[in-house]
């Protein structure tokens, strides 16, 4: 047995005399031999769920449904109950209704076995009949709402009338009927006014029914037509199966390059016509399980539920559905000399479904993790200024296929051939495995001697200790030209184009700081800037050279504070500025500003 | 606050070693560099040594080369100054100062400790 | 290295008088110039760098000019806080040099 609503409302005047019938609950059948029986709670609530008093005004027919007024609630009783109220004015009173036998403690009220009852308080007695508006004759102030289990015996859930109404107005006249097209699974009996269903509803096919409810009220000569919106909701229980889409119940999956922990190898997907369990239930009541097969395959991958509420057409309407992604993930990072193939086997159980038919199923992954072998091309040829600062990036090294690896650590190493010349480091880049090439001593980079540089590049996968080698030859470039000491270290520091451009700053590949003129469009990503190589500064990124020394581009990675129009990066820098952004290292400190009209560039752009 | 403060001076003989130190707080000293500047008595100011942010560059006026080592530990918020083989011509108060990559002058100064080098 | 001459060496003025110090380096230094103050027994205090740029907290009073070779330091109106000796400092190249200084006096 459930309710088919878990709320109604009704309205209570002072002195309104005992007897005087209320309004109607109504129970759905779950099965067609249980017989509805209905109790109140013992109290009335108030405010904020206080308990204000014993119930000793309102009954209930426990067979029929019907609560109406025991003894007339006079001003006395009233102010006793607004008394208990923690000083609010009270202006709504609630009752719990139980079904019987449901044994619920009095203190919870769930629907669908406890519904509650609300009435709105009026300090006054029940007005005069002709003063009653049509829409107050016809229908509550709130409107109802109904629920109705799909696969259930049909029944009775709503009666139309106000009950006060009739009782205290018995000369005026008011019909009802409900608005629905054809073949709808709802009638209004004409003489009780009572809304049932014609057959059990599958929501499968429906899941909401929005009716129109019609109310036509006669007083004498008048003739007066009232409607309000009557939605039906069904409820939904696991009576579908769950299916794959297309047919489809195999992935076949290669792992090569991405051998990351929490890759996701394949994806199967699973329908099912329900959107019940709920989610909180459903990864319990709705299991995946890898089947045994051999030990590595069980410690190698395992299986993700992501299911997720989906719409799909029936009838002409849409109603919910769930779709279950079944994901084959990586459980550990794979070493690059694994090499295997296996067929793995998931059994999908929706363990609420009670038939008919099974609501089991079995996907099949089809696996091959295929080994990868380092290579790098024989021979790497780059170019350097001899005027490039410390930490300026002149180039990347990478093993063939390496911006496509996730889960494989190779780390980069130089070897020179002159002890004296050793001018490049290399440190890995962690966003796609590559070797970025930074200049690391800018003295050997002055030596004549120094004008070609050999370095054998070392690529080694840290798991396996596995190699790739190549030939490096850096030719150096252009004649060296002092900085000037009072240059700021970073070019960061300048805030005009001119300043900028005539100093160098760590960073530097020509020795030189570049501008970045933004496009001065509010805050953007897009801010004017001064920068050792606009290429990688800024970016929004703080990479792993950059990460060496805040003086390099503080833009991307400065963790103190930045000062005006501004959207701070993730984690750290500048993600958006307003104007020009400089900043002061040392200081932890980043300005961002409107453009600075002064500049003699401005001038001349002017002209 | 911002704040420099040596120590190790006194009277050493002619060609002894002695180590000045700066004490820093109040501002993140790993990010500034470091310089010592002296002041014989009567005399004008004269730059000694600087030293980088993280200790990777040094710069000496000609007179102390190859006798003074400049050094910083950053962990302590401190500079040093070894002073070796020292000449009566090396008598002065000796003033630490902080000089920031943005700027390179010398903005936050100590309040000076005195060597004397005499026999 | 980058020599600085100052001049005057000695400069007498009263409260209120605009006086005005000269730097001269011997070959060109851009603006990589500043100017301290030092009264005796104490440390020196940075006033103006990057030629004309006044150090926050310095009164206005105090200003910087020039580039390249020549540098003057003036001061407005003389203020009895004022009576001290100045330098001028290049830092063009890591040889930071400063001048001899000015002593400025009481008339």
């Known amino acids: 047995l459930y309710f088919s609503r878990d709320a109604y409302w009704e309205k209570l005047y002072v002195d309104q005399a005992a007897g005087t019938p209320l309004l109607y609950v109504h129970a759905l059948r779950d099965a067609p031999e249980e017989v509805p029986s209905f109790r109140l709670g013992q109290h009335l609530y108030g405010t904020y769920r206080t308990r204000l008093h014993e119930n000793n005004w309102i009954c209930i027919q426990e067979d029929t449904g019907l609560l109406y007024l025991n003894r007339s609630l006079d001003h006395s009783s009233w102010e006793k109950l607004s008394v208990r109220n923690r000083g609010f004015p009270l202006l709504t009173v609630y009752l719990k209704v139980f079904l019987s036998p449901t044994s619920l403690r009095e203190g919870e009220c769930q629907w669908p076995g406890c519904a509650r009852v609300y009435f709105s308080f009026f300090n006054t007695s029940f007005p005069a009949c002709s003063s009653l508006k049509p829409r107050e004759l016809c229908f509550p102030e709130t409107r109802p709402s109904f629920r109705i289990r799909e696969n259930r015996p049909p029944g009775t859930f709503h009666q139309f009338r106000l009950l006060p109404v009739q009782f205290l107005c018995p000369n005026i006249s008011v019909a009802y009927r409900l608005l629905e097209g054809e073949g709808l699974p709802f009638r209004c009996a004409p003489d009780s006014l009572e809304v049932s269903t014609r057959w059990a509803l599958d929501r499968e096919q429906r899941e909401k029914y929005e009716l129109v409810a019609v109310c036509t009220v006669h007083a004498g000569a008048r003739e007066e037509v009232v409607m309000v919106p009557f939605p039906v909701t069904v409820y939904d229980e696991d009576d579908s199966a769950p299916t794959f889409p297309a047919g489809v119940d195999t992935a076949s999956a290669v792992v090569e390059f991405k051998r990351k922990e929490d890759t996701v190898v394949a994806t199967l997907r699973v329908f099912d016509a329900d959107v019940v369990p709920a989610s909180g239930e459903l990864v319990r009541r709705y299991t995946s399980t890898l089947l045994p097969g051999d030990t590595w395959a069980q410690q190698t991958f395992r299986v993700e539920h992501w299911p997720n509420e989906t719409s799909v057409q029936a009838n002409g309407s849409f109603v919910r559905a769930t779709v279950h992604d079944y994901r084959l993930v990586l459980n550990r990072n794979l070493s690059i000399s694994e090499n295997r193939t296996m067929q793995l086997a998931v059994l999908v159980n929706d363990s609420d479904f009670q038939g008919p038919g099974a609501g089991v199923l079995l996907l099949h992954f089809n696996v091959s993790v295929l080994p990868v072998s380092l290579h790098l091309p024989s021979t790497y040829s780059l170019s350097v200024s001899r005027r490039a600062r410390r930490f300026a990036q002149i180039g990347k090294v990478c093993v063939e296929n390496c911006q496509a690896f996730s889960g494989i650590n190779v780390q980069y190493k130089l070897h020179s051939s002159g002890a004296n010349c050793s001018t490049l480091g290399v440190v890995t880049s962690a966003e796609d495995t590559s070797g970025i090439l930074f200049v690391n001593d800018t003295k050997a980079l002055r030596r004549p001697k120094c004008a070609e540089l050999h370095y054998m590049v070392v690529a080694t996968d840290q798991q396996t200790s596995r190699q790739a080698q190549a030939q490096l030859l850096v030719t150096v470039e252009g004649s060296y030209v002092a900085e000037e000491a009072g240059c700021p270290l970073s070019c960061a520091v300048s805030k005009r184009r001119l300043e900028c451009e005539e100093c160098g700053g760590l960073g530097s590949p020509t020795g030189r700081c570049e501008w970045r003129q933004g496009d001065g469009k509010g805050i953007t990503r897009n801010f004017s800037t001064c920068s050792p190589s606009t290429k990688t500064c800024p970016d929004g990124h703080c990479d792993v050279v950059e990460t060496q020394d805040i003086n390099i581009c503080p833009q991307d990675c400065l963790r103190g504070s930045i000062v005006g129009g501004h959207e701070p990066g993730e984690p750290r820098g500048i993600k958006a500025g307003y104007g020009t952004c400089n900043c002061f290292p040392e200081e932890e400190k980043c300005f961002c500003e409107p453009e600075d009209i002064q500049d003699p560039l401005c001038d001349e752009l002017c002209r | 606050q911002v704040q420099l403060v040596e120590s190790g001076g006194g009277v050493v003989q002619p060609g002894r070693s002695l180590r000045l130190s700066c004490a820093a707080s109040g501002f993140t000293f790993s990010n500034y560099g470091m310089v010592w500047v002296r002041q014989a008595p009567g005399k004008g100011l004269e730059w000694v040594a600087f030293i980088w942010y993280d200790g990777s560059d040094k710069y000496y006026v000609d007179a102390v080369k190859g006798r003074f080592t400049i050094s910083r530990d950053n962990s302590k918020n401190t500079l040093y100054l070894q002073m070796n083989s020292l000449r009566a011509e090396d008598t002065a108060v000796y003033f630490c100062?902080?000089?920031?990559?943005?700027?390179?002058?010398?903005?936050?100064w100590g309040q000076g400790t005195m060597v004397t080098v005499s026999s | 290295d980058i020599q600085m001459t100052q001049s005057p060496s000695t400069l007498s003025a009263s409260v209120g008088d605009r006086v005005t110090i000269t730097c001269r380096a011997s070959?060109?230094?851009?603006?990589?110039l500043a100017w301290y103050q030092q009264k005796p027994g104490k440390a020196p205090k940075l006033l103006i760098y990057k030629a004309s740029s006044l150090e926050s907290g310095v009164p206005s009073r105090f200003s910087g000019s020039g580039s390249g070779t020549e540098f003057t330091l003036t001061i407005s109106s003389l203020q009895p806080d004022d009576f001290a000796t100045y330098y001028c400092?290049?830092?063009?190249?890591?040889?930071?040099?400063f001048g001899q200084g000015t002593k400025l006096e009481i008339k």
């Open positions: 400092q290049q830092y063009n190249s890591y040889s930071y040099t």
């Open positions: 100062a902080r000089s920031g990559p943005s700027r390179h002058v010398f903005d936050i």
């Open positions: 070959q060109s230094i851009s603006s990589w």
